[in-house]
Amino acid sequence: MAVTACQGLGFVVSLIGIAGIIAATCMDQWSTQDLYNNPVTAVFNYQGLWRSCVRESSGFTECRGYFTLLGLPAMLQAVRALMIVGIVLGAIGLLVSIFALKCIRIGSMEDSAKANMTLTSGIMFIVSGLCAIAGVSVFANMLVTNFWMSTANMYTGMGGMVQTVQTRYTFGAALFVGWVAGGLTLIGGVMMCIACRGLAPEETNYKAVSYHASGHSVAYKPGGFKASTGFGSNTKNKKIYDGGARTEDEVQSYPSKHDYV
């Protein structure tokens, strides 16, 4: 039961995280106009990975896409790439993890295959989360650098556009969404990897014979089975001694040294 819960929770946390990474990538508020020096502007500027926007006090919002690819700074391109890689890996990880879920039965898929898939998706989630965190952090660093370097007619980190003297940018909501989402995806991936360990039977399984000797309950373990070629080849082996109540997961799993007292 604990394994299923860990796996399920890992999947849900990763799903939320990846949704957050997608949301952050699409959001326009990666950087927002710093209002510290001049809070009374009738125009509020904010910028995303794909376009920059203005919200006028008249109520109108206008956005302009970065229609150039070569004209954009390398750092912005790198952030875009990291976020997209994060989304792609996360999406593939989600797809793999759906089939790996213990609660979902697909044909005669063995638990060993599910364990491998769980581990694969877990690693994908971890890398996805790291990509998102890295992307957001690179952008944040770019903002901090530009904030202090901001002078009249300086080319900023956003598409080589002229930075007017009064417009300095600070962290936007998307950065925080990205950090949290990346963290969640990372945590979800770790949980999937932990769940994988519980799903996978050990290399050596022991047939246990229990008997009572001098008043003590002892588990006698004669020779082990020959190492199997795959995790799922010993499906016919049964435990001779059941040491007590088992959780649902333990009943379905293979014998291990922890099953005996």
């Epitope: 009374v40 125009v43 006090s57 206008e62 007017t164 009064q166």
Partner: antibody, heavy 117, light 113 residues
Framework: EVQLVESGGGLVQPGGSLRLSCAGS????????MSWVRQAPGKGLEWVSS???????YYLDSVKGRFTISRDNAKNTLYLQMNSLRAEDTAVYYC???????????WGQGTLVTVSS | DIVMTQSPDSLAVSLGERATINCKSS????????????LTWYQQKPGQPPKKLIY???TRESGVPDRFSGSGSGTDFTLTISSLQAEDVAVYYC?????????FGQGTKLEIK
């Protein structure tokens, strides 16, 4: 056709109060940012106050604390409550709608406020 | 506050001739978000409220004759009337719409020579 009609102007003594109204027809004032602009006799234009979405208000420094901009959505009317009036507040007061580029595109005909003893 | 300075204060131009009015802002009005300049030109005839001619420094208001054009960026702007007509006699104002308080130029009185 969009029309903005100001009213409430008149002669008032220094230190007195007036409430200007701007009634809109052919336009729902609550959906737009609105402004008051004044023009002293023979002088240029001077922005006085604006109210934008969410009821956020902005004022010229010289009228801050004395003037209050507000609107009544049910009556489709914009107001400018003017207290502690001074001689330098004498002007024609216009209400105007803010539109693209924060520009004032529709203006009323104005109402004259005279502050004199 | 942003100071808007118009030049000249008054201008006399012959009918059919070009009229040019300048406006200078004490700070850049260019928005980095949409690359637009937040400057508006108004025309005011005696006894009438102002009328918007140009917004975003160069975008002509619908219904405004195409002889009126706006140009400039950052801090320096120009209103040009390519061929002056009798009905163009008025006072012209520039206004910055970027910062509060919104400020106007002192106005330029355009007359026929």
């Amino acid at each position: 056709e969009v029309q903005l009609v100001e009213s409430g102007g008149g002669l008032v003594q220094p230190g007195g109060s007036l409430r200007l109204s701007c009634a809109g027809s052919g336009i729902t004032l609550s959906t737009y940012a609105m402004s008051w602009v004044r023009q002293a006799p023979g002088k240029g234009l001077e922005w006085v106050s604006s109210i934008i979405s969410g009821g956020i208000t902005y004022y010229l420094d010289s009228v801050k604390g004395r003037f209050t901009i507000s609107r009544d959505n049910a009556k489709n009317t914009l107001y400018l409550q003017m207290n502690s009036l001074r001689a330098e507040d004498t002007a024609v007061y216009y209400c105007a709608r803010k539109y693209h580029g924060n520009a004032l595109d529709y203006w009323g005909q104005g109402t004259l406020v005279t502050v004199s003893s | 506050d942003i100071v808007m300075t118009q030049s000249p204060d008054s201008l006399a131009v012959s009918l059919g001739e070009r009229a040019t009015i300048n406006c200078k802002s004490s700070q850049s009005l260019l928005s980095s978000g949409n690359q637009r300049n937040y400057l508006t030109w108004y025309q005011q005839k005696p006894g009438q409220p102002p009328k918007k001619l140009i917004y975003w420094a160069s975008t002509r208001e619908s219904g405004v004759p195409d002889r009126f054009s706006g140009s400039g960026s950052g801090t320096d702007f120009t209103l040009t009337i390519s061929s002056l007509q009798a009905e163009d006699v008025a006072v012209y104002y520039c206004q910055q719409n970027y910062f509060y308080p919104l400020t106007f130029g002192q106005g330029t009185k355009l007359e026929i020579k």
